[in-house]
Amino acid sequence: PGPPPGPPRVSPDPRAELDSTVLLTRSLLADTRQLAAQLRDKFPADGDHNLDSLPTLAMSAGALGALQLPGVLTRLRADLLSYLRHVQWLRRAGGSSLKTLEPELGTLQARLDRLLRRLQLLMSRLALPQPPPDPPAPPLAPPSSAWGGIRAAHAILGGLHLTLDWAVRGLLLLKTRL
């Protein structure tokens, strides 16, 4: 095998990786909260909005104590992939009224993409199971009207906010177990 190589190149320790993932998730949560508030200011929401294609909320805060690391990361990755797809769809098909949310919506998409990559790297470093992704969902139908696009935006940002809030709590709890 030849001589031993020199000191290997340094990359982040999984615990440091988890720390930076928490920071990134918090930052994304703040972005989402701000964007949701911006949307409410421009287009006040008349009650709660939901979208059947969005993932159901992963877990109540009270159930966090029983979490296992693989389950949290796998579920979080799957849910965030779904939200990424919905944000992409919103930017593409949301209509002219939602153009007022740019460039913030584009920034949100880029940060969501970055968080997903960070989660996957963390799972690889820990050698946690990364199950095959769900089969591709059917394409999302364009909103039926401009107001339909706005309602969808309320639902997507609201759901993402709840998911990220759960994610921060879950990741902080998991940090104590690593």
């Epitope: 990359s11 999984p14 946690l128 992704p133 690593l178």
Partner: antibody, heavy 114, light 111 residues
Framework: EVQLLESGGGLVQPGGSLRLSCAAS????????MHWVRQAPGKGLEWVAV????????YYADSVKGRFTISRDNSKNTLYLQMNSLRAEDTAVYYC???????WGQGTLVTVSS | QSVLTQPPSASGTPGQRVTISCSGS?????????VHWYQQLPGTAPKLLIY???ERPSGVPDRFSGSKSGTSASLAISGLRSEDEADYYC???????????FGGGTKLTVL
Amino acid sequence: EVQLLESGGGLVQPGGSLRLSCAASGFTFSSYGMHWVRQAPGKGLEWVAVISYDGSYKYYADSVKGRFTISRDNSKNTLYLQMNSLRAEDTAVYYCAAGVPDYWGQGTLVTVSS
Amino acid sequence: QSVLTQPPSASGTPGQRVTISCSGSSSNIGSYYDVHWYQQLPGTAPKLLIYSNEERPSGVPDRFSGSKSGTSASLAISGLRSEDEADYYCAAWDPSLYGPVFGGGTKLTVL
């Protein structure tokens, strides 16, 4: 400085067994998933097995499933590979690697021949 | 036959820019799984060169860069040097294996 030091390689007859060890230092061993990767003479890299940071998940390449067992002892910072029913095609340099893999040992040669 | 396909060889002259491709499928690289690149100098163990498609571990010169698009990835080496002569491997997570899969490797020759 990160170090991964493999040992236990050598010449073994077909059907025989060997146990490889990998001693880790210079990083938090218990926070990393660990792999065994092999390289047959003049060939490319082939992933063999992986074990999660806490030892609760283990996965194997189809070519070694049922014959090789990966394990770890976090209290000793050591990774193991128990190889049974060895075949000529298992002849390779075996590397232990940590993380993505981010860090690699220098390898230990396993030769299966009669 | 590797699940990830790389050209067996590549070459360039000192100072040149060389690109090595790595082609996968919708079940690995195309399924949001990151690509990592390794350099194996003659007679030594592999070393991580690029992780998460484009991130460089500390100590890796910025002459090395990575990118990913769709189901393929590429490694670019600019300002080629004689010491870059080595085998280069791409790797990605393969969900059917529950482990990483490596490309067949590309032997880079500096002319």
